[in-house]
């Protein structure tokens, strides 16, 4: 399920006629939170609801990916009258409730961020006492994880006609720019493929034909830093093999 507007519904009054105006369900989340990989981030989420003074059992849930259907990453339950929300699920033990659901706050802390955490998160609250009701953030909060470049793979591979090619794959956010340097190359952005489908933070650069022996260095750089790694090509002349 996809939602098209930022989820900042105001605390509208019910337009039906009541003896006293009732609060409506709404959830307030920021459109985006940014943090660096390795750090922690807080995903804010507060809500209003129409059930005055509800103190029955409640469950707080956060899911990732898409509302209503995405996998749960955190869940806790509070017994009637209790302000303690007992954690029932915390994916990889990295999710912790910061807010107090009894005070309409479902804010979540995510520890030890990784690039894979870069996605949208949706908060949900469920009442299961005399009142049976639930509500879920429709748009959610985008967790934007930034990271300095890291070269995850560098290799030399054989290609047709006894030639060789080099591949360099790096990750980072923003996606890093890759450059090759080496014998008779200077600096080259040789055949950058970026980003790979389903691997939004991975960038690959290929040197299609290594014509000289020697050291080939791949440099990855973005606004947060740079990283480099090298491979060595040494061909046994007169033979078809190579040492790297």
């Amino acid at each position: 399920f996809v939602r098209t507007k930022i989820d900042t519904t105001e605390n509208l009054l019910n337009t039906e006629v009541h003896s006293s105006p009732a609060q409506r369900w709404s959830m307030q989340v920021p459109p985006e939170v940014s943090a660096e990989a390795g750090d922690a981030a807080v995903l804010p989420c507060t809500f209003t609801h129409p059930h005055r003074h509800y103190d029955g059992p409640l469950t707080a849930i956060w899911r990732a990916g898409e509302p209503y259907a995405g996998p749960q990453v955190f869940r806790c339950a509070a017994a009637r009258g209790s302000e303690l929300c007992q954690t029932a699920l915390s994916l990889h033990g990295r999710f912790r409730l910061l807010g107090n659901p009894r005070r309409n706050d479902l804010s979540l802390r995510v520890e030890r961020l990784a690039l894979a955490d870069d996605r949208r998160y949706f908060c949900r609250v469920e009442f299961a006492g005399d009142v049976h009701d639930r509500y879920e953030s429709r748009h959610g909060v985008r967790l934007h994880v930034t990271a300095a470049p890291r070269i995850v793979n560098i290799s030399v591979l054989p290609s047709p006609a006894h030639a060789f090619r080099a591949l360099c794959t790096a990750e980072g956010e923003p996606p890093p720019a890759l450059a090759w340097s080496g014998p008779a190359l200077g600096n080259s952005l040789a055949a950058v493929r970026s980003p790979r489908e389903g691997h939004g933070h991975l960038v690959t650069a290929e040197l299609p034909a290594l014509t000289h022996d020697g050291r080939y260095t791949c440099t990855a750089a973005n606004s947060l830093g740079r990283s480099e790694a090298s491979v060595y090509l040494f061909r046994f002349h007169g033979a078809s093999g190579a040492s790297t």
Epitope: F1, R3, T4, K5, D7, T9, L12, N14, T15, E16, A22, R24, W25, S26, P50, P67, Y68, A69, E126, A128, H132, D133, R134, Y135, E136, R138, H139
Partner: antibody
Amino acid sequence: QVQLKESGPGLVQPSQTPSLTCTVSGFSLTTYHVHWVRQPPGKGLEWMGVMWSDGDTSYNSALKSRLSISRDTSKSQVFLKMKSLQTEDTATYYCARDHQDNGGYAHFDFWGQGVMVTVSS
Amino acid sequence: NIQLTQSPSLLSASVGDRVTLSCKGSQNINNYLAWYQQKVGEAPKLLIYNTDSLQTGIPSRFSGSGSGTDYSLTISSLQPEDVASYFCFQYNSGWTFGGGTNLELK
């Protein structure tokens, strides 16, 4: 009393983008949500999307790239546009009111009579 | 999304029979389940909501029960006008309909 009525072209050429209209009476679009549901001939019901009372929209993820829901509250109308219709989109299209009037969501308590859309060249 | 499986897909019964239709969810539905009746050429009509609440104007021979992932609709004494398709519908997490049960007279 609560009423919903769908209208739109009965016959649509493949790849066209028709607009269906749901005209409501007896309730306010700013208080209640309105959903769109479709049913191919002889088959089951498929939830398509919702116009929330606050003017927001949510869509079935399998259809989201082709759907657009909008509204005109002054005319008490909700619109469904679906891009690039194919023969498999031939169905009766219903709008239905969500029972919940407090911003939350619930079952659908009132339905329109439906409009049959046939996609054929 | 939550998937709903209805069984049987076709049910033949006699007038006066007690009839039970089943609906099973792929995950917990938390009692947010409704039942609709649909006659040929008509829009679906709400019978039961929140698992066991009877919609206003619906005969008391219709009743619903269940919890968790398993739910059922019971017609205590089948009448000729009950011949129709019946759909279950979950609204716990998003909105999903079951595939339907066609109820016919023997």
